[in-house]
Interface confidence: medium
């Protein structure tokens, strides 16, 4: 028997520095977790103790903090090189700055293979990107070889900016021939490493013949065997065992997100490459694990110029941006309109001639807006200003919901109106009318939504049985502020870009902004 240790990360999202327990900015260092310096300490410890170790990343290193805003992926290449990753799969967020923003900082600079079998380049891009990412890679590990085959969410064109010269194929259809090729090369230990979410990971384990282990990402799935060490609630045991169509037991793993855990899976293979046993658990990277001093020093060096970024002008406002709780928790506020407009603008993807855009709606809990911005400071808006408005380090995500769920959400928005509670929704691409004289749960008297399958966008009544795409904060997607119906009834959830980054990009693009209160939210006469 031959034993392999798989160390894995996914959805790190630019958390190069240690973070608080909820993966936001580290405040009290003695309670902080993760970060590449701490990760390196643990990885090196395991490399010294065990003979056959692979360090893998399942995508979405890009996007999430000011590190990515400034360094655009160069920080990913540098620190992944320093940690000596063995392979990485492409995630959807790796395309956030277009193909060029992937090729230059990461693909050309990475000293490890970057993989995806289901992304095919065409046209002029084919020769430009040739060899910079691969469908699979055979890695020598000790006296053996291990094949790693990559995959990426086929939804990427709707979630990011891969352009028109990359085709995202069905994962299972694309993976099978590559695995077959590895078999003909006498590679009998094969890991599928990819970024399509836990459901697809399980399908790959079930359907792709010859895959021994699946290491996934995208859904931020936390798996754990035994008592979990922090706040995350396990979605299943680690590893999650799937019985394949040809009768094999295939371990599937994922390691939550944000570099908080290091996935740790031990696999025993027989001489024919069959998995005999698999066991392990994610390792919580808490403060009991010291940060490696050399990597920490390197982090501090790269930081020098980040601090200055926060105070630089992104653009100007010529109006007061009312982000006060007195406004945003009671009525339409122009800060809410600005943020929602930025959220929609960030998700413009013209992927189908029938649709002007794939999504037109935004909802945003008023309690998530934490500060106004005064235009009398020469109109200047800085990252620092936006960090006061959106201090929680969240993301603006894409969900699919039925109309009936949206209706429930808007009823919840005003079910206890008047108490300055955070669930009052700010909107974009939605016109809502409330009648507060009616009883809670029956206060939404009009709910019109902007069409997407139209050449001239207009507002139509919400249809209860129709499925709609909506951009919203991850906080709401996870059921925050009492929006349990969103969490329980959502049909799809894809994590998006860092909230501040979305708004800062929009302001930089617009240069001068003047959001108004324009009747998106109304109260019927006599009730307000």
């Amino acid at each position: 028997a031959w034993e392999l240790t798989i160390l894995h990360t996914n959805d790190v999202h630019s958390r190069l520095e240690q973070t608080s327990e909820d993966s936001s900015k580290c405040v009290n260092a003695s309670r902080c977790m993760g970060g590449v310096a701490r990760l390196f300490t643990k990885v090196q410890q395991i490399r010294r103790a065990e003979p056959n170790v692979l360090l893998l990343d399942a995508g979405d290193q890009y996007q999430g903090t000011i590190w990515f805003t400034v360094y655009k992926g160069a920080e990913v290449a540098h620190f992944m090189n320093a940690l000596r990753y063995d392979a990485m799969a492409l995630g959807n967020h790796e395309f956030d700055n277009g193909v060029e923003g992937l090729i230059e900082p990461l693909l050309k600079e990475a000293k490890f293979p970057i993989l995806s079998a289901n992304i095919k380049a065409k046209g002029p891009l084919a020769s430009q990107i040739s060899g910079l990412y691969l469908p699979y890679k055979v890695l020598p590990v000790g006296d053996e070889v291990v094949g790693i085959v990559g995959y990426t969410s086929k939804e990427t064109p709707f979630l990011s900016n891969p352009g028109t010269n990359l085709v995202f194929e069905d994962e299972i259809t694309a993976l099978q021939p590559e695995v077959d090729k590895l078999k003909t090369l006498n590679v009998n230990k094969i890991i599928a490493l990819g970024h399509s979410g836990f459901e697809m990971d399980k399908l790959i384990a079930q359907k792709v013949r010859g895959v021994d282990v699946v290491v996934g990402g995208h859904s931020n799935t936390f798996l754990y065997t035994g008592n979990p060490p922090s706040k995350e609630v396990p979605a299943g045991k680690y590893p999650f065992i799937v019985t394949s169509d040809d009768g094999r037991k295939v371990p599937v793993v994922q390691a939550y997100a944000f570099g908080k855990y290091l996935g740790y899976l031990k696999i025993e293979f027989d001489e024919r490459g069959n998995v005999i046993s698999s066991h392990g658990n994610p390792i919580l990277l808490n403060s009991s694990i010291p940060e490696d001093p050399s990597i920490k020093a390197d982090i501090n060096k790269w930081r020098i110029k980040l601090d200055n970024y926060s105070t630089q002008e992104l653009g100007k406002t010529i109006v007061y941006l009312d982000g006060s709780s007195q406004s945003c928790r009671f009525r339409e506020c122009n800060m809410g309109n600005l943020i929602c407009d930025a959220m929609i603008n960030n998700n413009l993807r013209h992927t189908d001639e029938m649709f002007w855009n794939h999504v037109s709606m935004c909802i945003l809990n008023g309690g998530g807006i934490r500060s106004p911005i005064d235009e009398r400071n020469n109109g200047t808006i800085t990252w620092e200003n936006l960090a006061a408005v959106l201090p929680f380090g969240g993301t603006f995500d894409l969900v699919q919901l039925k109309g009936s769920t949206l209706k429930k959400a808007f009823e919840h928005s005003v079910h206890r109106y008047g108490q300055s509670t955070g669930e009052f929704l700010q909107v974009g691409g939605i016109h809502v009318v409330y009648d507060l004289s009616r009883k809670p749960g029956d206060r939404v008297v009009k709910l019109d939504v902007l069409c997407t399958k139209c050449r001239v966008p207009s507002y139509d009544p919400l249809k209860m049985d129709e499925v709609y795409k909506v951009i919203l904060p991850n906080f709401l997607a996870n059921g925050g502020d009492g929006f349990q119906m969103i969490k329980d009834e959502l049909l799809r959830h894809d994590s998006g870009d860092q909230d501040i980054n979305v708004v800062s990009t929009y302001i930089s693009k617009m240069k001068v902004i003047y959001p108004a209160v324009e009747g998106r939210i109304k109260f019927s006469t006599g009730s307000h």
């Epitope: 160069a74 501090n300 020098i304 200055n308």
Partner: antibody, heavy 120, light 111 residues
Framework: QVQLVQSGAEVEKPGASVKVSCKAS????????ITWVRQAPGQGLEWMGD????????NYNEKFKTRVTITADKSTSTAYMELSSLRSEDTAVYYC???????????????WGQGTLVTV | AIQLTQSPSSLSASVGDRVTITCRAS??????????MHWYQQKPGQAPRLLIY???NLESGVPSRFSGSGSGTDFTFTISSLEAEDAATYYC?????????FGQGTKVEIK
């Protein structure tokens, strides 16, 4: 090999503006900071500011903040430094330089352009 | 801004001499085990050339007679055995915080 090639000498009148270019080759332009440094005749080196071409992020020396604009064009791997409201004391050689980056982010200036003499 | 003071401002030495230049910072430029001090050589009519980075690391292609040391606020640049081609002005520069500043320079002449 890494090269930074700057535009030619300029003679400008007081109050005018000057824009100096710096074309980079031989490395990934978007992944390293470009710094601008000037040197008046017979004087020392003065750090003016820098740009990260990957994001367009800039930092300026307070002394020049209101008059200098540093930009970068990723498509041509060219950085620019524009200085406005020129006065006689701006007569100097203006250098662009590449900062160390991916191997050690120490911000030492490891490659320099040949310099552009601006006479006001 | 951090001020850097070089001394001496000029010196004259013979070929084969050991030459030492010091650079004092008005504030610590060391942290996390790194000292953000660099040394450059500039010959008349030429652009500066990086010799030493992070206080003591020799840039590739630079002769080993050049060296640097120091931490905190006090740094030293040494030419162990002066050669005729070393006649130039030498500058220290810090990159600990913005703005990055240079010392005023030390002119080295050959006797």
């Amino acid at each position: 090999q890494v090269q930074l090639v700057q535009s030619g000498a300029e003679v400008e009148k007081p109050g005018a503006s000057v824009k100096v270019s710096c074309k980079a080759s031989g490395y990934t332009f978007t992944s390293y900071w470009i710094t601008w440094v000037r040197q008046a005749p017979g004087q020392g080196l003065e750090w003016m500011g820098d740009i990260y071409p990957g994001s367009g992020n800039t930092n300026y020396n307070e002394k020049f903040k209101t008059r200098v604009t540093i930009t970068a064009d990723k498509s041509t791997s060219t950085a620019y430094m524009e200085l406005s409201s020129l006065r006689s004391e701006d007569t100097a050689v203006y250098y662009c330089a590449k900062e160390g980056g991916l191997t050690t982010e120490d911000y030492a200036l490891d490659y320099w352009g040949q310099g552009t003499l601006v006479t006001v | 801004a951090i001020q850097l003071t070089q001394s001496p401002s000029s010196l004259s030495a013979s070929v084969g001499d050991r030459v030492t230049i010091t650079c004092r910072a008005s504030k610590q430029v060391s942290t996390s085990g790194y000292s953000y001090m660099h040394w450059y050589q500039q010959k008349p009519g030429q652009a500066p050339r990086l010799l030493i980075y992070l206080a003591s690391n020799l840039e590739s292609g630079v002769p080993s007679r050049f060296s640097g040391s120091g931490s905190g606020t006090d740094f030293t640049f040494t030419i162990s055995s002066l050669e005729a081609e070393d006649a130039a002005t030498y500058y220290c520069q810090h990159s600990r915080e913005l703005p990055f500043t240079f010392g005023q320079g030390t002119k080295v002449e050959i006797k």
